[in-house]
Interface confidence: low
């Protein structure tokens, strides 16, 4: 493979070798060069699986906000706009990462933490158990 | 809102009210008790708007593997089985938080970035637009 | 799919050589750091060692310094770990882990194979 040898202008640490703690640049920089079309779409409303957002808040977690999907039904919208019950909404959920403050109330350390959150709602065939 | 004091254990920081750059540990808590739904789920092949899940790899990026979604078709599955163009298969997107190093190939510096993924496909309603 | 499979665990005696591979596959292999990582009867998980991408840095737990080596073959897929003059102490499960960019930090390893050393 390549060699990749470590940059001279890295910041010095305690321990190269394996730090347990590293510096983090909050000045984020966003790769998303379009705005961001879940915020200004109406999917949540047009969907055959509708969701509703939740404002989930936590001040000693970065980012603060994050928004959770609840889907509104059981089943899904069909083509007369009634609820059908032989599909279902379920939610699509990702691991995130966020940054939690550890000590908690301090303004400058953090520690890593995975979440899982539910970005949205989509429709599926149930799986039926057949009783014998 | 509620004063929250400052922990008095607080790693010392030259900007005590703006840091740019936080101390981060990386003991990762994962606060998911079960398994990830999403990774043992079928949800992708059941659904009404199917996707394909892509493997966007980046060995200088935390996560460093990313799985992104490709909604397979234009339109929906109907009962039938069959790609009903008179629904949409859209997907639903996510801003989520990645680490990536900098300055490049330092073991210990990182900044926070934003990417836009897509975590999986809703079936919607289109919009249509009547001419005049 | 990631996957990492151990193997070249057994009983030895002390003073003994063990050497461990892992064969992993489902990711590009000379792109990340791997890891041997053990875990002791009753006790937590432990790290033993530390490969670069290119095999060109090793770093090792103070406990094994001198005795135990840690090498890659990115042609084949495999990580290794030459285990000599080994002490009761070594006795552990050994799980192989590929590294992130994170340090310590691994998102797979391997069901592990055990090492017992016991007279």
């Known amino acids: 493979g390549i060699t990749i040898p470590r940059n001279p202008g890295c910041p010095n640490s305690e321990d190269k070798n394996f730090p347990r703690t590293v510096m983090v640049n909050l000045n984020i920089h966003n790769r998303n060069t379009n705005t961001n079309p879940k915020r200004s779409s109406d999917y949540y409303n047009r969907s055959t699986s509708p969701w509703n957002l939740h404002r989930n808040e936590d001040p000693e977690r970065y980012p603060s906000v994050i928004w959770e999907a609840k889907c509104r039904h059981l089943g899904c919208i069909n083509a007369d706009g009634n609820v059908d019950y032989h599909m279902n909404s379920v939610p699509i959920q990702q691991e995130i990462l966020v940054l939690r403050r550890e000590p908690p109330h301090c303004p400058n350390s953090f520690r890593l933490e995975k979440i899982l959150v539910s970005v949205g709602c989509t429709c599926v065939t149930p799986i039926v158990h057949h009783v014998a | 809102g509620i004063t929250i004091p400052r922990n008095p254990g607080c790693p010392n920081s030259e900007d005590k009210n703006f840091p740019r750059t936080v101390m981060v540990n990386l003991n990762i808590h994962n606060r998911n008790t079960n398994t990830n739904p999403k990774r043992s789920s079928d949800y992708y092949n059941r659904s009404t708007s199917p996707w394909n899940l892509h493997r966007n790899e980046d060995p200088e990026r935390y996560p460093s593997v990313i799985w992104e979604a490709k909604c397979r078709h234009l339109g929906c599955i109907n009962a039938d089985g069959n790609v009903d163009y008179h629904m949409n298969s859209v997907p639903i997107q996510q801003e989520i938080l990645v680490l990536r190093r900098e300055p490049p190939h330092c073991p210990n510096s990182f900044r926070l970035e934003k990417i836009l993924v897509s975590v999986g496909c809703t079936c919607v309603t289109p919009i249509v637009h009547h001419v005049a | 799919q990631v996957q990492l499979v151990e193997s070249g665990g057994g009983l030895v005696q002390p003073g003994g050589s063990l050497r461990l591979s892992c064969a992993a596959s489902?990711?590009?292999?000379?792109?990340?750091?791997m890891y041997w990582v053990r875990q002791a009867p009753g006790k937590g998980l432990e790290w033993v060692a530390e490969?670069?991408?290119?095999?060109?840095?090793?770093y090792y737990v103070d406990s094994v310094k001198g005795r135990f080596t840690i090498s890659r073959d990115n042609a084949k897929n495999s990580l290794y770990l030459q285990m000599n003059s080994l002490r009761a102490e070594d006795t552990a499960v050994y799980y192989c882990?590929?590294?992130?960019?994170?340090?310590?930090?691994?998102?797979?390893w391997g069901q592990g194979t055990l090492v017992t050393v016991s007279s």
């Open positions: 490969i670069k991408q290119d095999g060109s840095e090793k």
């Open positions: 882990a590929k590294g992130e960019i994170l340090p310590l930090y691994f998102d797979y």
């Open positions: 489902g990711f590009t292999f000379s792109s990340y750091g």
